[in-house]
């Protein structure tokens, strides 16, 4: 079948999800496409525990996640509710800063060097993290 029962080569399994950590940079939309071509999505952080796991693997490097407000409200790429979900913004962020001189504000979220989140210009070539969930069907215990 099409069930994903284990993580692909070079991906890291954690809490029934698979994660892939880039070592090169792309703009947010290009990173999003990269993940999609892997049948995955940019990482969606749903807990402090997941935050610490991702932070441990990326180190102190700006890294895209699957959170943006390019169409108005902040949205996670997999549909996870933003308002009620986990957040870890830096103080006074997101600020949609226009002072960078690159045109427009800041519509894409990334992990900063201390792991907390910031909104930034989506065209910046940051590293990124892809995530894909192991299928629920594969979580069923085997029949004895």
């Amino acid at each position: 079948g099409s069930e994903r029962t284990c993580c692909p080569v070079n991906w890291v399994e954690h809490e029934r999800s698979c994660y892939w950590f880039s070592r090169s940079g792309k703009a947010w939309a290009d990173a999003d496409n990269y993940c999609r071509l892997e049948d995955a999505h940019l990482v969606v952080v749903t807990s402090w525990e997941e935050q610490k796991f991702v932070q441990h693997h990326i180190g102190p490097v700006n890294t895209w996640m699957g959170l943006h407000d390019q169409n108005g409200p902040w949205k996670w790429v997999d549909g996870t509710d933003y308002e009620t979900g986990f957040k870890n913004w830096r103080p006074e962020q997101p600020d949609d800063w226009y002072g960078h001189g690159l045109g427009g504000g800041e519509d894409c979220a990334h992990f900063t060097d201390d792991g907390r989140w910031n909104d930034d210009v989506c065209q910046r070539p940051y590293r990124w993290v892809c995530e894909t969930e192991l299928d629920k069907a594969s979580q069923e215990p085997p029949l004895l």
Partner: antibody, heavy 118, light 107 residues
Framework: EVQLLESGGGLVQPGGSLRLSCAAS????????MSWVRQAPGKGLEWVSS????????FYADSVKGRFTVSRDNSKNTLYLQMNSLRAEDTAVYYC???????????WGQGTLVTVSS | DIQMTQSPSSVSASVGDRVTITCRAS??????LAWYQQKPGKAPKLLIY???SLQSGVPSRFSGSGSGTDFTLTFSSLQPDDFATYYC?????????FGQGTKVEIK
């Protein structure tokens, strides 16, 4: 040994349709993105379309968007390209290629010629 | 779309020559670049990926370098089997795009 074998090319009138197939062997087909790349006679290479390993995501060049559809049947290790509303400028050799999300094409088929002419 | 421009469009060289061909991207693509070799009537063959990584089985006389917008493919000592057309390809952004090709001919 990785092998990719295209079929389905031929002569078709403008406005017509054609479906190309690419039979794959020698690797775990469902684990890799696949792509179509074309080359008009005497011209350079043009990326046409890509599809993720499990078929959940597809990507197209603007020149074929809305006319071509890429799909795959992992149970048959086969990649497809359904081409509708064909135009003279679609005349080319069509290659299927094993790729990945990084976009490098490490294995190619031998190509199949599509000629669109009245 | 990102435009890829190769130069020269053709080059005449002799066996044993050191030859360099270049590829320029219309915007920065970090190291998301590949090089292919194509011979008449045949499918392209991957030589270099990630700007400078040699594909398995490709002779070490081929090397790639560059990042950002400017890239080069170098033949340290041209061999008879190397006379072909070479294409660069960017995979930084969709649509993935190729250069127009550089034909390496026998002098």
């Amino acid at each position: 040994e990785v092998q990719l074998l295209e079929s389905g090319g031929g002569l078709v009138q403008p406005g017509g349709s054609l479906r190309l197939s690419c039979a794959a062997s020698g690797f775990t087909f469902s684990s890799y993105a696949m792509s179509w790349v074309r080359q008009a006679p005497g011209k350079g290479l043009e990326w046409v379309s890509s599809i993720s390993g499990r078929g959940g995501s597809t990507f197209y060049a603007d020149s074929v968007k809305g006319r071509f559809t890429v799909s795959r049947d992992n149970s048959k290790n086969t990649l497809y390209l359904q081409m509708n509303s064909l135009r003279a400028e679609d005349t080319a050799v069509y290659y299927c290629a094993k790729s990945n999300s990084s976009g490098w094409f490490d294995y190619w088929g031998q190509g199949t010629l599509v000629t669109v002419s009245s | 779309d990102i435009q890829m421009t190769q130069s020269p469009s053709s080059v005449s060289a002799s066996v044993g020559d050191r030859v360099t061909i270049t590829c320029r991207a219309s915007q920065g693509i970090t190291d998301w670049l590949a090089w292919y070799q194509q011979k008449p009537g045949k499918a392209p063959k991957l030589l270099i990926y990630a700007a400078s990584s040699l594909q398995s089985g490709v002779p070490s006389r081929f090397s790639g370098s560059g990042s950002g917008t400017d890239f080069t493919l170098t033949f340290s000592s041209l061999q008879p089997d190397d006379f072909a057309t070479y294409y660069c390809q960017q995979t930084n952004s969709f649509p993935w795009t190729f250069g127009q090709g550089t034909k390496v001919e026998i002098k």
